[in-house]
Amino acid sequence: PLATIPVSTTSLTSSEGSTISTPSVDISTPVTTSIVGDQCSRCKNGGFWDGLKCQCLTPYYGESCEEVVNSIDIAPPETVSAQMELTVTVTSVKFTDELKNHSSQEFREFNKTFTEQMNIVYSGIPEYVGVNITNLRLGSVVVEHDVLLRTKYTPEYKTALDNATEVVKQKITKVTTEQIMTNDNCSALMCFNTTGTQVQNITVTQYDPVEECRQKAEEYEDYFLVEYRDQKPYCISPCESGFNASKNCNHGKCQMSQNGARCLCVTTETHWYSGEDCNQGTQKSHHHHHH
């Protein structure tokens, strides 16, 4: 089949000196392009033909998936979390076998009181979400549990969660030192054995926007970078305007290649432009240089 695509051409010269013609839509000069055989061959860089158009893979776009996008969507999670595996020993309750059964009346009651006690302990920590008992065992009651922390994603989320885990350690150490049995009795909601408090493990959500950006940029990974705007990360190439790393091509168009971003300088009716940033203009008639 024959496709008629009306275009006019603007001459662009790359900063290396070669001239490239890029199409811009115009009704004045009709050009016919013959598309023969398998449509899949039209789609470059791993793109595929869906019957109507090329479906391109990141980071490509264009009619034949031949162009590289200026920015790639990266989506950090709304919230990030940490899980602390802790063990405390509760002395104000005597262990019974029923506590091993998570559906028993005894476990449910213990869970309610323990949760209430921990909510009091951690009440001043904004990242605190709650506790989850994983196991109860003899001794009086050794409580293996997770402390769950959550915060909104910001570039500094790791620091925020690290600080919160430190406060958790301080608070649980304090309460298990202060709320202890006196004369075989507890006057608090729960009492603890000071020596039974241990932090076993801390797991923090791992999200690295730079890593996601590099992965999605594929062979262009060295040329895409992350910049922040309003605490949100953006994965951009230097061809994306409005960022610190943006390349200014002046009288030209920024284009990504496998060697990085380069400027394709325009040639107008009166001037041609050259230089790495297309900032050197030469007047065609007078051959006069000006900057």
């Epitope: 002395t91 104000s92 309750v93 005597k94 019974t96 029923e98 028993s104 009346q105 005894e106 009651e109 213990f110 309610k112 009181t113 049995m181 075989d184 009795n185 507890c186 006057s187 608090a188 909601l189 729960m190 009492c191």
Partner: nanobody, 124 residues
Framework: DVQLQASGGGVVQPGGSLRLSCAAS????????MAWFRQAPGKEREVVAF????????YYADSVKGRFTISHDNSKNTLYLQMNSLRAEDTAVYYC?????????????????WGQGTMVTVSS
Amino acid sequence: DVQLQASGGGVVQPGGSLRLSCAASGYTSNRYSMAWFRQAPGKEREVVAFIWTDGGRTYYADSVKGRFTISHDNSKNTLYLQMNSLRAEDTAVYYCAASSLLLQTINPRAWPYWGQGTMVTVSS
């Protein structure tokens, strides 16, 4: 859920005796804790005594030691408080409380189940 029904309060002269009862229902096990607390007008609720129904533990507040006896009848699921040598300062509303755990705490907040109060007045 656990239900508690307290009874046996009344007016008694100093030096007299009273026996409080608290019937429990809704337990899935025969091993749990029960307690008596009291609250005098304008004061905080305080523990009087507690017992483990398996006989493993009893506790008495210093102010009632030697005068009050806590006991539990497993066949009737009933808690008792035998109060002898009553004094004016024993005047209060007496509450029975329970837990499905074997508790060793005198803090009322640790006890999840409560009966309604029964009034004990010691007055001449």
